[in-house]
Interface confidence: low
């Protein structure tokens, strides 16, 4: 997270760290007792590594009573996700068992009404991604509030040049932005999960390259079919 600040500890009980061989790889969001939603591209280079999900965490390194690392029973990338596009960049991870819920671990309601969030709406994005252009990784969860950007502006030739389909949304990126390591994390508007940070090599913090988020409402049928 660029230009943000440390989050209040455990105030985002839905927040997950998707880990590869014990190290933070991507963000994720608990959407059901046994399911975490993240970004498909996160597992592209996982190969034979051990993928796990950390829940109830604020600090990645310090012991916390609510922290628990879960093995992954099943990883379900969206069937249409492809390495070279940002489209359909969603991944559902089934935990090895139902998460133990509590004040620091709780699923987040996700948006099902397939309607764009109004431009200018302030949404919260959180993650353990890099906090500066030098690539410094934080130990504790960071967050930032970002205004939603209308699709027409986001699709300008100087911005994302038509790449933002109706299944994607954008948020402003002027010095405050999500970045590498935040992929798969939640974009939360009005207490509801609206978007998932897309993974990719987008430049962060540049106002002409807005943050891109997968709209979960556009994938409600797929999410339901996997969780059923």
């Amino acid at each position: 997270i660029l230009g943000g600040r440390e989050a209040e500890a455990h105030a985002r009980p839905y927040m997950a760290s998707v880990q590869l061989n014990g190290a933070h790889l991507c963000g994720g969001v608990l959407v059901a007792e046994q399911w975490v939603l993240s970004a498909a591209h996160c597992l592209e280079d996982a190969a034979d590594g051990k993928v796990q999900v950390l829940l109830g965490a604020h600090s990645l390194s310090q012991p916390e009573p609510s922290k628990r690392l879960y093995d992954v029973l099943r990883a379900v990338p969206h069937p249409d996700s492809q390495p070279d596009t940002i489209d359909h960049d969603l991944l559902l991870l089934q935990l090895s068992e139902k998460a133990t819920l509590g004040p620091a671990v709780r699923p987040l309601p996700w948006q099902r009404v397939d309607r764009d969030v109004a431009p200018g709406t302030l949404c919260d994005v959180a993650g353990w991604g890099i906090v500066n252009h030098a690539g410094r990784r934080p130990d504790s969860l960071q967050h930032v509030l970002l205004p939603v950007l209308d699709r027409a502006t986001c699709n300008r030739r100087t911005h994302h040049d038509g790449a933002i389909t109706e299944r994607l949304m954008c948020a402003e990126s002027n010095r405050r932005d999500s970045c590498k390591g935040d992929s798969g994390g939640p974009l939360v508007c009005g207490g509801v999960l609206e978007g998932v940070v897309t993974s990719g090599s987008r430049v962060c913090g540049n106002r002409k390259k807005p943050g891109i988020y997968t709209r979960v409402a556009s994938y409600a049928a797929w999410i339901d079919s996997v969780l059923a």
Partner: antibody, heavy 122, light 107 residues
Framework: EVQLQQSGPELVKPGASVKISCKAS????????MNWVKHSPEKSLEWIGD????????TYNQKFKARATLTVDKSSSTAYMQLKSLTSEDSAVYYC???????????????WGQGTLVTVSA | DIVMTQSHKFMSTSVGDRVSITCKAS??????VAWYQQKPGQSPKLLIF???TRHTGVPDRFTGSGSGTDYTLTISSVQAEDLALYYC?????????FGGGTKLEIK
């Protein structure tokens, strides 16, 4: 304006079945789970189960699982609850209710039908 | 199943008074509690969810608080139209369960 219009009162005999309808309007029917709730003076409010109108997927309260069947007709934006093998204890008002802004039933039931009175009597 | 207990079946109050209706869960429900108001002859109406978030259009005299197993609905200045049954409900895990209700009576 969100509206849930339920079918009228039913007088049924013990051992019979009843099927109640709930017609939704004013919102995208498939975007919200539909819940069914039993209201009796003895047991207060009891959640029977819910159905995802988009997929037809159901979750039942174990207490009602053997006797309740939830279905939807997407073309008419109508949800149905069938209750079989009725006894006098099933005499109650039955409500349909949708969840608030999220398909997950985490945040309570924001919109309710007017209720359907079912009386089980010989 | 999680049992929600509203120990007071009836509460008597006067217009303008402050009143608190309590609800106790049989286990920690992690602030996942909603409150409903049901007036005679009407369907229940959602007032509050996630312990303290007011539903659209609910007057700000209604506030919710609590954590763990203990939750409270407070009406800061009771109005005559607040005469009703009030139910708590946990939305922590299925099956969603309700309290037995508290009937608010106006003296």
């Amino acid at each position: 304006e969100v509206q849930l219009q339920q079918s009228g009162p039913e007088l049924v005999k013990p051992g019979a079945s009843v099927k109640i309808s709930c017609k939704a309007s004013g919102y995208s029917f498939t975007a919200y789970y539909m819940n069914w709730v039993k209201h009796s003076p003895e047991k207060s409010l009891e959640w029977i189960g819910d159905i995802n109108p988009s997929t037809g997927g159901t979750t039942y309260n174990q207490k009602f699982k053997a006797r309740a069947t939830l279905t939807v007709d997407k073309s008419s934006s109508t949800a149905y609850m069938q209750l079989k093998s009725l006894t006098s204890e099933d005499s109650a008002v039955y409500y349909c209710a949708t969840t608030y802004y999220s398909g997950n039933s985490y945040v309570g039931f924001a919109y309710w039908g007017q209720g359907t009175l079912v009386t089980v009597s010989a | 199943d999680i049992v929600m207990t509203q120990s007071h079946k009836f509460m008597s109050t006067s217009v303008g008074d402050r009143v608190s209706i309590t609800c106790k869960a049989s286990q920690d429900v992690s602030t996942a509690v909603a409150w409903y108001q049901q007036k005679p002859g009407q369907s229940p109406k959602l007032l509050i969810f996630w312990t303290s978030t007011r539903h659209t259009g609910v007057p700000d005299r209604f506030t919710g608080s609590g954590s763990g197993t203990d939750y409270t609905l407070t009406i800061s200045s009771v109005q005559a139209e607040d005469l009703a049954l009030y139910y708590c409900q946990q939305h922590y895990t299925t099956p969603w369960t309700f309290g037995g209700g508290t009937k608010l009576e106006i003296k």
